[in-house]
């Protein structure tokens, strides 16, 4: 994942005595918040593994990279990062592993330079449709986000509110068409069973899409046609059985694409013939020589590239009168 990194320049820790020493005064504009480490040279603030329950109020105006990982934030309310003056420089925000389960509409408003956002490893039971767009207008102001990292944000089964988790995430991605400039989207490890068909068409700038380690069974209704800039598509560790002709043609038509398909339970029957033919010819699949059959049993562990049409048969469907019970 491409979470923000910082240079190793010296960090000033806010010493425990500082809070009481300045208790009667408002905080200085570029003072380091309690429980954080700050480097003005690196424009970086780290408030990591400190069990913070809210976003610090007195973040220095110079902050470009903000790490709020390993905390207990629970909720990001509207305007969680809104400050006077605004945090105009903040470009990379990492909130991973901070026990967030609720991100409200407008949580990231007033961050005009925010390009990278990492919300991974938070059990997001309640992600507002307007978390990233900030308003419920049909067309919102464009978000500056270029990278959105949402790996492992699926909440436990009992906290999913009897609604489609996929639908909730996609609604947030598409609201107000705010994320038209998004180039990297990571959605790995989210138990996705399907990809809603409209999602990719509305993210035309995508260069990198990571859907690995989900439970995707099929891409039949997913169109990649508009993603002319797509450079990498990660589909490893899903439940894909076969890629059909329409999908193969669309992938082949993308000029810069690299596709990763390892560790899927490929079903090597007559429906696999087109995919095998395509694999033998295409250059877009990385590590294609590692792809093996999972089913039927007689084909298990056979390498897809080594199959020929005679290997790919379907058992005849018997008329009902001949079927055994």
């Amino acid at each position: 994942s491409s979470s923000p990194t910082s240079s190793a320049s010296s960090f000033s820790s806010s010493a425990p005595f500082l809070a009481s020493a300045v208790s009667a005064q408002p905080p200085l504009p570029d003072q380091c918040p309690a429980l954080c480490e700050c480097s003005e040279a690196a424009r970086t603030v780290k408030c990591v593994n400190r069990n913070l329950t809210e976003v610090p109020t007195d973040l220095p105006a110079y902050v470009r990279n903000l790490f709020l990982t390993g905390n207990q934030l629970a909720v990001l309310p509207a305007g969680a990062f809104a400050r006077r003056p605004p945090l105009a420089e903040l470009a990379a925000l990492n909130l991973s592993g901070s026990r967030l389960d609720e991100v409200r509409a407008g949580a990231f408003e007033h961050l005009p330079s925010l390009r990278q956002l990492d919300l991974s490893h938070n059990p997001l039971a309640d992600l507002s449709p307007f978390a990233f767009s900030g308003s419920n207008a049909s067309v919102s102001a464009p978000s500056p986000l270029v990278e959105l990292i949402l790996n492992h944000i699926v909440p436990p089964e009992d906290e999913r509110q009897n609604r489609s988790f996929e639908g909730m995430v996609v609604a947030a991605l598409l609201a107000g068409r705010a994320l038209q400039g998004l180039r990297r989207l990571e959605l790995a490890s989210n138990h996705f069973l399907y990809l809603p068909r409209d999602v990719l068409a509305q993210l035309p700038s995508l260069r990198h899409l990571d859907l690995s380690n989900n439970s995707l069974v099929s891409l039949t209704y997913v169109s990649f046609r508009n993603l002319t800039h797509l450079e990498s598509l990660h589909l490893e560790d899903n439940a894909l059985k076969v890629l059909h002709n329409g999908t193969l043609a669309e992938l082949q038509g993308l000029p810069h694409i690299r596709v990763f398909l390892d560790n899927n339970p490929w079903v090597c029957d007559c429906h696999m013939a087109d995919m095998v033919t395509w694999l033998k010819e295409t250059e877009v699949v990385q590590g294609k020589d590692r792809l093996t059959c999972a089913y039927p049993e007689k084909m298990r562990n056979r390498v897809l590239l080594e199959l020929n049409s005679a290997d790919l048969d379907c058992d005849p469907i018997l008329p009902p009168s001949l079927q055994t019970s």
Epitope: A19, P33, A34, L35, C36, C47, R50, N51, L52, T53, E54, V55, P56, T57, D58, Q72, A74, V75, P77, A78, D101, E102, R104, A125, D126, E159, Q161
Partner: antibody, heavy 120, light 111 residues
Framework: EVQLVESGGGVVQPGRSLRLSCAAS????????MHWVRQAPGKGLEWVAY????????YYADAVKGRFTISRDNSKNTLYLQMNSLRAEDTAVYYC?????????????WGQGTTVTVSS | DIVMTQTPLSLSVTPGQPASISCRAS??????????MHWYQQKPGQPPQLLIK???NLESGVPDRFSGSGSGTDFTLKISRVEAEDVGVYYC?????????FGGGTKVEIK
Amino acid sequence: EVQLVESGGGVVQPGRSLRLSCAASGFTFSNFGMHWVRQAPGKGLEWVAYISSGSSTFYYADAVKGRFTISRDNSKNTLYLQMNSLRAEDTAVYYCARSPAYYRYGLDYWGQGTTVTVSS
Amino acid sequence: DIVMTQTPLSLSVTPGQPASISCRASQSVSSSTFSYMHWYQQKPGQPPQLLIKSSSNLESGVPDRFSGSGSGTDFTLKISRVEAEDVGVYYCQHSWEIPYTFGGGTKVEIK
């Protein structure tokens, strides 16, 4: 047993300052966010200020913003409210109250309060 | 700011009878997973005491004749059988956003 004991109240003239303290015991003070809430004579409750467990986050009601400062000293298990430029409308009983680390759960323990009277 | 409106202003109840207090927020204070609404009791000469947190969760040590319900903008505190010790003022409060605001209070008296 959780205990919160406020002190520092008194009678003060308008424009002057006062510092309230709240001594906490019976729980791990550094794990909890703390609030000040006030109640004018015969009136309802008004939230005043909040400070997070590690002092990284603090919020104020508009009525006191720029005049009051909330702080804490976790080594002394003590919460403070520095009140400057006091006005007649600041006259109230001031309570300190605790909230669990997740602020969603309400104010679960309150002190007995300390009375501030602003009068010329 | 979110305005909390409590009704009624006062309530005179016969011991053993039920009582109900309503609180309406000027905007929703619930997410799909959580309600940020709490109820307090303030007996004469004492500080407030938390009765119910997040709409319906009884605080430990609070008698189970108290219950809370509601979501969004409308919330209710119920006392199934009022007892003499229940006299006092009851307040609702939200923690949806800063500033937290309280309702104006409902005074409960015994007939």
